[in-house]
Amino acid sequence: EEELQVIQPEKSVSVAAGDSATLNCTVSSLIPVGPIQWFRGAGPGRELIYNLKEGHFPRVTAVSDPTKRNNMDFSIRISNITPADAGTYYCVKFRKGSPDVELKSGAGTELSVRAKPSAPVVSGPAVRATAEHTVSFTCESHGFSPRDITLKWFKNGNELSDVQTNVDPAGKSVSYSIRSTARVLLTRRDVHSQVICEVAHVTLQGDPLRGTANLSEAIRVPPFLEVTQQSMRADNQVNVTCQVTKFYPQRLQLTWLENGNVSRTEMASALPENKDGTYNWTSWLLVNVSAHRDDVKLTCQVEHDGQPAVNKSFSVKVSAHPKEQGSNTAAENTGTNERNIYGGSG
């Protein structure tokens, strides 16, 4: 009598997650009487996948009708494959008994599952950084198989090179994760810039997945401050302007101080955006020179995005000699970021 053979023709089968996998197995003889069982893995820890004899295996069906005696095909189909189904499957013939006696195993078929990576998620720094600083962005994607994957970073279409990428785990696994960090040097022009993390994988058929982050979430562009005085009006009032320019984000509070005392506080809102994404804001303060005997120190104090306040100060000189005054006297810069403005007390 010819020796029983259990034939698993495919050494490996690769299936896309969600599809069905067919694992082929034929036997050369139905003698002796006894069941065929399918296992994943070998040895004492093997997992029973299908038992023609009994049990409930909702995702597994016999390819051929096992109730036909002349049927020597014991192939199975596993539906709705997930990465967790990956492994080596063995078709095993038993002789009927108590317990059933294992007679012969097939050589095994390795099932690998092609699983798409999840959509890349890009996260930026927890706190904003100013221009000329370098910030880190991370990109993560999970659940893909096989392990081979390509990840690229772009800033405004240009590939970034300061990148560190890891695929985990290092050894064999049912699915893998990728984590990449890109270091990006910020410039004042980056409010409208975008970084893109692009993931390419065999399951994506050449159509990579992309995750994006806007640098607007990571950057802070501190304002420039300029204080100017308009011409003295006939009513002895001086119009002082504080120009706050090229800042981002919009969150900004401006406080006018007269001789150290708060005169007025304003919050920026609904400002028009510059082409580069930054904002400008101008605030005016009208100072009645005739109401002051002594010099007036005016300070424009700007608190931007929760950062320490930036000051620009003026000294308005109250003069008893109107002839000495200029109607629009040039500013005199001092070490304390002050400007001296001479006004007549008239």
Partner: antibody
Framework: EVQLVESGGGLVQPGGSLRLSCAAS????????MHWVRQAPGKGLEWVSA???????YYTGSVKGRFTISRENAKNSLYLQMNSLRASDTAVYYC????????????WGQGTMVTVSS | DIQMTQSPSSLSASVGDRVTITCRAS??????LAWFQQKPGKAPKSLIY???SLHSGVPSKFSGSGSGTDFTLTISSLQPEDFATYYC?????????FGQGTKLEIK
């Protein structure tokens, strides 16, 4: 339709012989283990004999050496040659098909009556 | 030989009842146990194999369980056509052996 039809039963004297036949239709008999089961009047079921797909044969102790099971593939038929019959062999004899991979009985014939009496 | 013992030998029940018949093997038979139904003057009908698998066409009111030496056949809601004699059988090794039968009668 899968069917088993027995024939050959009848009245026979103790020590006599009888050959039972079982004609199979709807399937290939040689692909299955086949069995004979009997039931004495008013009694329970008793397995008598079997023939495997490889031609291997099995018998219950009380019929060993007296009964012979065989099959004829060309006629898709199963036989039970009964010699040296005894009164205790009186029963309805059923031809039964063994299930696919574990030999669980699935198809039964209608039975044929064998009476051994003088 | 493996001895098969059924209990009870007879059982009276009413239509709609749930009944359980037990079968014990004299040694471990794995789950190679079958159940058959037989009505007077008729050939047995195969109900269950490998202790719990229903043969094609057998209604789901029949269920089997057990492994090793102790087995049960349960009929969930008796109908008039279910009153018959039921046999268990081991088929793990030759000679195959049957239980003595359980006669299910209408109360």
């Amino acid at each position: 339709e899968v069917q088993l039809v027995e024939s050959g039963g009848g009245l026979v004297q103790p020590g006599g012989s009888l050959r039972l036949s079982c004609a199979a239709s709807g399937f290939t008999l040689s692909s299955y283990d086949m069995h004979w089961v009997r039931q004495a009047p008013g009694k329970g079921l008793e397995w008598v004999s079997a023939i495997g797909t490889a031609g291997d044969t099995y018998y219950t102790g009380s019929v060993k050496g007296r009964f012979t099971i065989s099959r004829e593939n060309a006629k898709n038929s199963l036989y039970l040659q009964m010699n040296s019959l005894r009164a205790s062999d009186t029963a309805v004899y059923y031809c039964v098909r063994g299930g696919v991979w574990d030999d669980a009985f699935d198809i039964w014939g209608q039975g044929t009556m064998v009476t051994v009496s003088s | 030989d493996i001895q098969m013992t059924q209990s009870p030998s007879s059982l009276s029940a009413s239509v709609g009842d749930r009944v359980t018949i037990t079968c014990r093997a004299s040694q471990d038979i794995n789950n190679y146990l079958a159940w058959f139904q037989q009505k007077p003057g008729k050939a047995p009908k195969s109900l269950i194999y490998t202790a719990s698998s229903l043969h094609s066409g057998v209604p789901s009111k029949f269920s089997g369980s057990g492994s090793g030496t102790d087995f049960t056949l349960t009929i969930s809601s008796l109908q008039p056509e279910d009153f018959a004699t039921y046999y268990c059988q081991q088929y793990v090794s030759y000679p195959y052996t049957f239980g003595q039968g359980t006669k299910l009668e209408i109360k």
